[in-house]
Every structure is written in C-alpha cells, then in structure tokens.
Amino acid sequence: EVEKTACPSGKKAREIDESLIFYKKWELEACVDAALLATQMDRVNAIPFTYEQLDVLKHKLDELYPQGYPESVIQHLGYLFLKMSPEDIRKWNVTSLETLKALLEVNKGHEMSPQVATLIDRFVKGRGQLDKDTLDTLTAFYPGYLCSLSPEELSSVPPSSIWAVRPQDLDTCDPRQLDVLYPKARLAFQNMNGSEYFVKIQSFLGGAPTEDLKALSQQNVSMDLATFMKLRTDAVLPLTVAEVQKLLGPHVEGLKAEERHRPVRDWILRQRQDDLDTLGLGLQG
C-alpha cells in the first residue's frame, strides 16, 4: 500500500499521458485522480507503466469501484489485467466478446492463469451457454480449453458450436468428455455426406458407441490406427473381425504393432482364432 502524501506542486495529472511513467509510486498515488484514470483507461495501455506502477493504478480503481469495475473500464485494462486476482474478477460482469478478447490477448502465449479461468467462467455463465463465437475465441487462445471443462459444463455446449472445434482442441480430452461431445458432433454433422462426415467426426469418435462404429465400417472410411486406439474399449469389443477389417481398411496391418495395447489387446482376446487368422497378421487370441 502506498502511503498518502500531498502531490508536489505542478505535478497534478491533468490527463493520463507518457509523463506519468516518470512518477514514483507515491506520486502516482498522490497526483492521479481515480476518476480521471477511469475515464482515460484507453490511454493506460499505450503507456509502458511498470508492474509496480500498475499496483498503484489498480489500487485507485479498487477505491473508485469497490463493487467491481464497469465493463467500460474492464475492456481497457490491458496489462493491468495481470494485476487482478480471481476475487477481483468475480465482481465483474463481462458481456462483450471484444472485452474478453482484449483481456485474453494480454495473457497470450502463457498458460491459462487462475485469473483467465475465472474470467472465462464469468463470461460463459453470463451468456448461459458456450456459443460458437465464444468457443471460437477461447480455443484460438487456448486449444486445450474444451478439455479443461467438466462433462457437466460441456453439456451446455450447443451442437452448433461444435463446428468451431478443431482436432487439436480435443487432444487432451478424456473418454468422459468425449462421451458428452460425440452426440453433439453427430447431431452437428448429420447432414454431411459419408467421407466429409468422417473427416469431421473422426476426432470425436472416442465417445462413439458400438452401433455407430458398426455403421462406419460399412462406409469404407479407412480409419487410421491412432483414431482406433482412442476408441472406447467397451465400444470396440463387440465388433467382429470383418467389421474391424472394413473399418480400418488398409490400416488393418497396424493391429499387429498394437496387439499388446488396449483396446486392441482386449478385442483380440474376444475373437475366435479362426477369424483372426483371416487377417493374416499372426494375431494370437
């Protein structure tokens, strides 16, 4: 906390400008009016205040807005956002996607901080659902964002938003999350033709049930081994050798290299040896 001292003669700030970066912390405290700061927040980010100077500016805004900052101030916080605690952010009501983007930009290139997580949570809750534009924005900044949500939170994602999801956004999702996302993806892509549908649905297949895998096996999709290895074991086990052969197409030879790993190992053990021998891969059931 900066102690209260009188502003030296001639140093009272009339506007937020570059000269303020030469003010010591106590001078900023004494000479910059909080209301002036709030009305000229758009200038703050254009001035390279140091981290310590930002402490003083935050303190001023906190005194002016004890119940939380208005969005007109939040959207111009810039680097001041780095000074906010999750407790500060919980007082905010952020409704504009542009405000969200501006604050995420400040944190760009860094891991998702508790502040960012709180900001996103406040924003999404305020909107009531994770709409396509929001999801587009969040996954652009944090490709792993979707997989950081609980299955319960994912249930609020409308199927239309699934179009914004890229394969890399699902890299860290676990089966429980894919169980929620797969039906939404199936619904979102239902009007696409066979090959296009498979390209879109492929990264969600870790949540697909047996009957959908059987249906895919009839469509010459040539699923790669990496996708096959991510399928639910309980969904793969009931598939016949013929269905797996059709599902994988030319990639079926890759089963040999994966015969000790799930779900291939468990699937092999469920098959008749005669059927496995038809593959000519030397798989032992």
Epitope: E18, F22, Y23, A46, P48, T50, Q53, L54
Partner: antibody
Framework: QVQLVQSGAEVKKPGASVKVSCKAS????????MHWVRQAPGQGLEWMGM????????IYYEKFQGRVTMTVDKSISTAYMELSRLRSDDTAVYYC?????????????WGQGTLVTVSS | DIVMTQSPDSLAVSLGERATINCKAS??????VAWYQQKPGQSPKLLIY???TRHSGVPDRFTGSGSGTDFTLTISSLQAEDVAVYFC?????????FGAGTKLEIK
C-alpha cells in the same frame, strides 16, 4: 530469431549531430517499444528513452530531452536515434534494445552497439 | 532517480569457486531487478529477472536473490566462460537505471 543490426562506428566533432540506425528482424517490428541505451568507455549503462514503432510515441529521459530524437521507418523495420549538440562526454557505445513485456522493462534483445566518438 | 550501487567493482575468483556480486538500490524496488552479463566487445545479455528468475538458456550455476533494496548475483562454481562484467538494473520505475558493473576475473 530476433536480430537488431546497428549502423557502423561514427566519429563526430563537438557540436555536431549523429544518427544511429537499428534494423530489426525476426519479430513484428510494430509490436514492441524500441529503447536506446548508451555505455561510455569503461562505464555502466545509461537508459536514454524509447519509441513505439506503431504509434511513433516517444518517451525521453529528462537528461537527454531537447537533444535526442527517436524515429522509425516502419517500411524497412528500422529505428533511428539522433543526438545533437554533441559533447566529448557523449563518446559511448549506443545500443538499441527491445523489451518484450512493457510492464517488465528488462532488456530481452540488444543490438551489437555503435561506437560514437566525439573528438575535436 | 533510483541509484543502483554495485559492489565490488572487480572480483577475482578461482575456477570452480563461488562468486558473489551485490547490488543496492537507493529506494525499495521490490523484486524488479534484472542482472546482465557483458563479455568484452559484446552487448549485454539478460541472465536474471524478477531478482531470481533465470532467463531461458542460462545455466543453473547463476542464482539471483534479494528484495527491497539489497540484491545478490551468485555464480556457484565459476567457469572460464563466466569472465565478464555483470550489471544489475532496476525496473521498478523510470528512468530505468543500472549499476556501474562488476568485473569478474579468474584468480
């Protein structure tokens, strides 16, 4: 990778001016403040000021105010520092440097330096 | 302006031994201190920031510590390539200011 390449050494007479250039590559030139720091022979480092290539905003250290002019040419990603009314104690190596995070003004990348000698 | 006073001016240490360089700020600067290494004929290179955070690629024999007004750079086991001048810098407030430097040599 980030590179800051400065112009060659200069010898100037007292009262003259010198203009040092700094060509940037390997990053978006308009994204970061460009700073200038000088080092007199066998001495410490002295910050002179900075310019933001996107806005042309300049901030000069009081000591150099009125004698220093910092400019940029965005089209060739080059920053310039001109020092006028040179004195013998302006003899120094002049460095351009960039700071990636403005709130943490540590110097992340430096030019190789330009020796300016002021002598009659 | 905040004055950064470095000590000693020069230091001779045997290979493999510990080298300690101090820096004192005229005002409280929190942990807003960086350390640089400058080898002869070269520009300075960032070693440490936030008083104790090593910059990427800096060997772990370099350690920074301190807060407020007193700061220390320690090289735990001196190597031949560590011969250089070391500078501290405060970035708590503008103007940014540096120490006068400490010349480190091998004994």
């Amino acid at each position: 990778q980030v590179q800051l390449v400065q112009s060659g050494a200069e010898v100037k007479k007292p009262g003259a001016s010198v203009k040092v250039s700094c060509k940037a590559s390997g990053y978006t030139f308009t994204s970061y403040w460009m700073h200038w720091v000088r080092q007199a022979p066998g001495q410490g480092l002295e910050w002179m000021g900075m310019i933001h290539p996107n806005s042309d905003n300049t901030i000069y250290y009081e000591k150099f105010q009125g004698r220093v002019t910092m400019t940029v040419d965005k089209s060739i990603s080059t920053a310039y520092m001109e020092l006028s009314r040179l004195r013998s104690d302006d003899t120094a190596v002049y460095y351009c440097a960039i700071i990636i995070t403005p709130v943490v003004p540590k110097f992340d990348y430096w030019g190789q330096g330009t020796l300016v000698t002021v002598s009659s | 302006d905040i004055v950064m006073t470095q000590s000693p001016d020069s230091l001779a240490v045997s290979l493999g031994e510990r080298a300690t360089i101090n820096c004192k700020a005229s005002h409280d600067v929190g942990t807003s201190v960086a350390w640089y290494q400058q080898k002869p004929g070269q520009s300075p290179k960032l070693l440490i920031y936030w008083a104790s955070t090593r910059h990427s690629g800096v060997p772990d024999r370099f350690t920074g510590s301190g807060s407020g007004t007193d700061f220390t750079l320690t090289i735990s086991s001196l190597q031949a390539e560590d011969v250089a001048v070391y500078f501290c810098q405060q970035y708590s407030s503008y103007p940014l200011t540096f120490g006068a430097g400490t010349k480190l040599e091998i004994k």
